[in-house]
Interface confidence: low
């Protein structure tokens, strides 16, 4: 449409237009996690606040049972931050004794589940070795990218160790998606 | 609107359409910070470049006195990166003497101020313990998420220690927002 | 347009409208890197997968020879994550001997190349000192922001050391851009 004068009578668009305010969107914030059963070799999923404080879902984007449910096919920007905190890792003690060790790590994965496909798809992963030597450590992992999703897809956030997630503040740990 | 043939005579939209290029947007870049008075227990706010180099504001999104002023209600994606750099923290020296200590830390907060509400709202926080043992350390904290904002809201970026902010390059420390 | 009832006969927009699904977009994912010649003082560029797995380009956004080619002027959100991994840096060994040293570092730069301008422009930089003391370390650097780009601009991702990039999984290291 570059350089074309705009008038409804000759509007040349090749797909339906839609008001931006009508697009599926969600921003979810952390809540205290209850210990949860998860499958061996699969990281546990976080559950989220979806309507209090800064959290919201709108325009048919629904949150249920740890999943964001995609109501409409299209390209979505998906993001999450998880803040981890812990005590000195064993790794640092071994290290101080002069025996280097495979470091402990913290990992966040944003995962897509499609009912018609047996295996979840890992969309985004942030993983970091943790070899801290102070008595307490804390740090965030941030992820964000664009993906083509189908109506009915479900999104979740998995972490390597749910007990290390900082659930104290809604601005520290969050998860969101919006249709572009 | 899925699958609907487009023609102006039967365009079915439920909110006004608008050209994307007309939406409020800003990308601000770091400048050298002047020491500033800030309230006890409140992190100092950064000020920013808004028109030179990579920086810009457009479509009524204005920058003034450390704040981005939101000109129109809606859902905004807000982001910032702050690169910190410093010398070895005291924490590491104490640690080397075998006395673990609460680590030093670096923190970035994106804050919303609403004139009609007395308390600022922390939208996003990235916080990280720093127990570095090299003589110089540097690292970024990145944040980004979507929030529903109201016309007149103001956004700022606060940091735990303004003297640790790397202000040398516009690509290292920045702050932006755009209406979705 | 706030509060205006929508009807084609009095649609008041000041730039052509366009369907969102028609906008240039790309998400590229990591592939194994081949050693590459690069100029002294310039970080090497990564090359990417553009059509397999999670990767895609659409609506005239093309990938060629390490570059994303911008097909249309406008404001783009650009993002990348690079996951690095390595063995203990020399820095930590020197440090253990009580001689603090300038830390090793890892750096990601998203660069814009404009044919009519001889110098590339660094849009985004994430740089981090690495003074790890475990035998193996790994960590991501994430970047994302909005920039005004011109038709014909080219985007690439440069890294300080291509041999440290984790190319094993498409969700760990990626690069994308989309027109807002």
């Amino acid at each position: 449409l570059k350089g074309q004068e705009f008038a409804p009578s000759h509007q040349q668009v090749y797909a339906p237009l839609r008001a931006d305010g009508d697009k599926p969107r969600a921003h979810l914030t952390v809540v205290r996690q209850t210990p949860t059963q998860h499958f061996k070799n699969q990281f546990p999923a976080l559950h989220w606040e979806h309507e209090l404080g800064l959290a919201f879902t709108k325009n048919r984007m629904n949150y249920t049972n740890k999943f964001l449910l995609i109501p409409e096919s299209g390209d979505y920007f998906i993001y999450s931050q998880v803040t981890f905190r812990g005590m000195t890792s064993e790794c640092s003690e071994i290290r101080q004794a002069g025996r280097p060790n495979k470091p402990d790590s913290i990992t966040v994965v944003i995962t897509k589940v499609t009912d018609s496909y047996p295996e979840p798809t890992q969309l985004l992963m942030g993983t970091k070795s943790v070899c801290e030597v102070g008595s307490n450590w804390f740090q965030p992992i941030y992820l964000g990218a664009m993906f083509s999703l189908q109506e009915g897809d479900k999104l979740m956030v998995n972490v390597s160790d749910i007990s290390l997630v900082d659930y104290t503040k809604e601005d520290k740990t969050f998860f969101g998606a919006f249709l572009l | 609107l899925k699958g609907q043939e487009f023609a102006p005579s039967h365009q079915q939209v439920y909110a006004p359409l608008r050209a994307d290029g007309d939406k409020p947007r800003a990308h601000l870049t770091v400048v050298r910070q002047t020491p500033t008075q800030h309230f006890k227990n409140q992190f100092p706010a950064l000020h920013w470049e808004h028109e030179l180099g990579l920086a810009f504001t457009k479509n009524r999104m204005n920058y003034t006195n450390k704040f981005l002023l939101i000109p129109e209600s809606g859902d905004y994606f807000i982001y910032s990166q702050v690169t910190f750099r410093g010398m070895t923290s005291e924490c590491s020296e104490i640690r080397q003497a075998g006395r673990p200590n609460k680590p030093d830390s670096i923190t970035v907060v994106i804050t919303k101020v609403t004139d009609s509400y007395p308390e600022p709202t922390q939208l996003l926080m990235g916080t990280k313990s720093v127990c570095e043992v090299g003589s110089n350390w540097f690292q970024p904290i990145y944040l980004g998420a979507m929030f529903s904002l109201q016309e007149g809201d103001k956004l700022m970026v606060n940091v735990s220690d303004i003297s640790l902010v790397d202000y040398t390059k516009e690509d290292k420390t920045f702050f932006g927002a755009f209406l979705l | 347009l706030k509060g205006q009832e929508f009807a084609p006969s009095h649609q008041q927009v000041y730039a052509p409208l366009r369907a969102d699904g028609d906008k240039p977009r790309a998400h590229l994912t990591v592939v194994r890197q081949t050693p590459t010649q690069h100029f002294k003082n310039q970080f090497p560029a990564l090359h990417w997968e553009h059509e397999l797995g999670l990767a895609f380009t659409k609506n005239r956004m093309n990938y060629t020879n390490k570059f994303l080619l911008i097909p249309e002027s406008g404001d783009y959100f650009i993002y990348s994550q690079v996951t690095f991994r390595g063995m203990t840096s020399e820095c930590s060994e020197i440090r253990q001997a009580g001689r603090p040293n300038k830390p090793d570092s890892i750096t990601v730069v998203i660069t814009k190349v404009t044919d009519s301008y001889p110098e590339p422009t660094q849009l985004l930089m994430g740089t981090k000192s690495v003074c790890e003391v475990g035998s193996n370390w790994f960590q991501p650097i994430y970047l994302g922001a909005m920039f005004s780009l011109q038709e014909g601009d080219k985007l690439m991702v440069n890294v300080s050391d291509i041999s440290l990039v984790d190319y094993t999984k498409e969700d760990k290291t990626f690069f994308g851009a989309f027109l807002l």
Partner: antibody
Framework: QVQLQQSGPELVKPGASVKLSCKAS????????INWVKQRPGQGLEWIGW????????NYNEKFKGKATLTVDTSSSTAYMDLHSLTSEDSAVYFC?????????WGQGTTLTVSS | DVVMTQTPLSLPVSLGDQASISCRSS???????????LEWYLQKPGQSPKLLIY???NRFSGVPDRFSGSGSGTDFTLKISRVEAEDLGVYYC?????????FGGGTKLEIK
């Protein structure tokens, strides 16, 4: 159309300073480098340096560091070059030119004569 | 600094002849972005230089097609297929790939 209009001829004494100007029109001034070039009588061309008007970033030929200072006034779309501590060696025609993928448009030149 | 060496210093021609000017750089002037910023300019007495060719072989708008540029790496050539009276003057090559940018010493095209 693109135009670069330079200030008129200057006659100055040795040791003095002078400020030459270059007013741009016909394009977005802030988005394209302005370069400065020196030409002594009957001689070739020497590149002095460039300035990027949008952020004031400069790059100088080492030979002219301390001799030339490049500045801009974006409000008037004007580039300036200050020349300091003038000697007879600085007598020359000075051109401004914008650089896209080439020095595609040039000013008409300003003649500087340094004489006591 | 990159030294640009032009030959010949002076080129006497008859109108209608072909003319060829050589420019050699002391090192490669391929920029790190892959482009070669080699340009040719013509300066007539009392005037500012005018751009003829940019990026080795691209004619600037309004430049007649009798002007052509070629070359790569360190060796470049400007050719004028049929010299006309308005082509007389001093020709300069210029590299904009490496700071400081540098000009060749010039070649004077004159009537034999």
């Amino acid at each position: 159309q693109v135009q670069l209009q330079q200030s008129g001829p200057e006659l100055v004494k040795p040791g003095a300073s002078v400020k030459l100007s270059c007013k741009a029109s016909g394009y977005t001034f802030t988005s394209i480098d302005i370069n400065w070039v020196k030409q002594r009588p009957g001689q070739g061309l020497e590149w002095i340096g460039w300035i990027y008007p949008r952020d004031g970033r400069t790059n100088y030929n080492e030979k002219f560091k301390g001799k030339a200072t490049l500045t801009v006034d974006t409000s008037s779309s004007t580039a300036y070059m200050d020349l300091h501590s003038l000697t007879s060696e600085d007598s020359a025609v000075y051109f401004c030119a914008r650089y896209t993928s080439s020095l595609d448009y040039w000013g008409q030149g300003t003649t500087l004569t340094v004489s006591s | 600094d990159v030294v640009m060496t032009q030959t010949p210093l002076s080129l006497p021609v008859s109108l209608g002849d072909q003319a060829s000017i050589s420019c050699r750089s002391s090192q490669s002037i391929v920029h790190s972005n892959g482009n070669t910023y080699l340009e040719w300019y013509l300066q007539k007495p009392g005037q500012s230089p005018k751009l003829l060719i940019y990026k080795v072989s691209n004619r600037f708008s309004g430049v007649p097609d009798r002007f052509s540029g070629s070359g790569s790496g360190t060796d470049f050539t400007l050719k004028i297929s049929r010299v006309e009276a308005e082509d007389l003057g001093v020709y300069y090559c210029f590299q904009g790939s490496h700071v400081p940018y540098t000009f060749g010493g010039g070649t004077k095209l004159e009537i034999k």
